[in-house]
């Protein structure tokens, strides 16, 4: 079914970033001595190289910019969710915060009026 | 049906980076002269934060590096890329069926050999 | 730490109505709001929430009637739409983990 | 989800135990998401045991919580006069909607 191939594109980008020391770190790649580590730059470079072959309307030949090429990864999965169009699954809550401390967990540290942004 | 969540999960891995900016730009936000510019670090914070929220068994109460936050995330979308890329069940003779929620539970588990490489 | 609920009152059926939980002490775009009902001599029973994202979750038999928004960094509304006798109820708002509660504010829906 | 609770009323003796059950028709989140309050006449919830067996700050440890998965129980030992109350048990699932789901609750009397 075509939800497949979005989700797989969308894995790309998460993962990417460093995927070769995903792959080691979990006893599934072959031993860093065996070849050059990448460096995170280098893995940036790799998962936005992955992003144009996976998202539609990001040819490779072109010039864009790592903004203009999210943009464009956000506009698929935006329209991919329109698509599906039904409400994702979510958690029943937040974590257990005591009630004197909780603004002071290290998970609260940045400013929490920022949050609503990202939705 | 649950195929959403992980497009949207996804979707907030990749999105938060810059998601205000395009909300402007697409003519769905506030004008960034009503608000503080948030910093590139507070946009990944606030992104992990969000993961935590969107992918089961990543519960925010407990401490996990971000490489942690990322693998669970990424075998939470391997998950759902076998479920998407199997048949639903249905009725003996039925048709297809969409893919119903019970099948995408935080328990689901798939054989981890699957998952070898972020491909 | 604290919250409190405002604006119930008795209204007529049909009538929608939106009540309003205050923080104080916290900033209400920190933290998971929910919404929970109790009719008289009845169980507790769980609307919804909005996260510190600003998702929405509802109780199945609460969408469509029931909205949870944030409206500042204190506040967060419930509106309340095709309100009927059944909706008769003290209703509360819990900040995440369920640790501190209101003390509730009823609605009455009657004729 | 459906959570069932010890049919009510459950009667103790002052100093002796109470144990009342909650079982969910699904597992709930993580296997461990079910919380256990407190709610006297009048009064808003009171949070004793959230994520199954973790006691909240200032709770007695007389409350005890245990289980796992779909079926969970609140254990009250050396009973008080105080602990006279309606006791709810709250399951929390990763869904589309229906994320909390609170028992109908269990009365406990003390004798």
């Known amino acids: 079914m075509k939800a497949l191939s979005p989700v797989r594109g969308c894995y790309e980008a998460v993962c990417c970033l460093s995927e070769r020391s995903l792959a080691i770190a979990r006893g599934r790649g072959k031993s860093p001595s065996t070849e050059e580590p990448l460096s995170l730059l280098d893995d940036m470079n790799h998962c936005y190289s992955r992003l144009r072959e996976l998202v539609p309307g990001v040819p490779r030949g072109t010039q864009l910019s790592q903004v203009e090429i999210l943009q464009r990864v956000i506009d698929y999965i935006l329209d991919l969710q329109v698509v599906l169009a039904e409400p994702a699954p979510g958690p029943p809550d937040g974590p257990h915060l005591p009630i004197q401390t909780a603004e002071l967990t290290p998970e609260l540290v940045i400013s929490k009026d920022k949050r609503s942004f990202c939705h | 049906m649950k195929a959403l969540s992980p497009v949207r999960g996804c979707y907030e891995a990749v999105c938060c980076l810059s998601e205000r900016s395009l909300a402007i730009a697409r003519g769905r936000g506030k004008s960034p002269s009503t608000e503080e510019p948030l910093s590139l670090l507070d946009d990944m914070n606030h992104c992990y934060s969000r993961l935590r929220e969107l992918v089961p068994g990543v519960p925010r109460g407990t401490q996990l590096s971000q490489v942690e936050i990322l693998q669970r995330v990424i075998d939470y979308i391997l998950d759902l890329q076998v479920v998407l890329a199997e048949p639903a069940p249905g009725p003996p003779d039925g048709p297809h069926l969409p893919i119903q929620t019970a099948e995408l539970t935080p328990e689901l588990v798939i054989s981890k050999d699957k998952r070898s490489f972020c491909h | 730490q604290s919250v409190e609920e405002s604006g119930g009152r008795l209204v007529t059926p049909g009538t929608p109505l939106t009540l309003t939980c205050t923080a104080s002490g916290f900033s209400l775009s920190s933290y998971y709001i929910h919404w929970v009902r109790q009719a008289p001599g009845k169980a507790l029973e769980w609307i919804g929430y909005i996260s510190d994202g600003g998702t929405t979750y509802y109780a199945s038999w609460a969408k469509g009637r029931f909205t949870i928004s944030k409206t500042s960094s204190t506040t967060v509304d419930l509106k309340m739409t095709s309100l009927t006798t059944e909706d008769t109820a003290t209703y509360f708002c819990a900040r995440q983990g369920f640790n501190i509660w209101g003390p509730g504010t009823l609605v009455t829906v009657s004729l | 989800a459906v959570l069932t609770q010890t049919p009510s009323p459950v009667s103790a003796a002052v100093g002796g135990t109470v144990t009342i059950s909650c079982q969910s028709s699904q597992s709930v989140y993580n296997n461990n998401w079910l919380s256990w309050f407190q709610q006297k006449s009048g009064q808003p919830p009171k949070l004793l045991i959230y994520?199954?067996?973790k006691l909240e700050s200032g709770v007695p440890s007389r409350f005890k919580g245990s289980g796992s998965g779909t079926q969970f129980t609140l254990t009250i030992i050396d009973v008080q006069c105080d602990d006279a109350a309606t006791y709810y048990c709250l399951g929390g699932y990763w869904s589309t909607s229906d994320n909390n789901i609170f028992g109908g609750g269990t009365e406990v009397v003390v004798k």
């Open positions: 994520e199954t067996s």
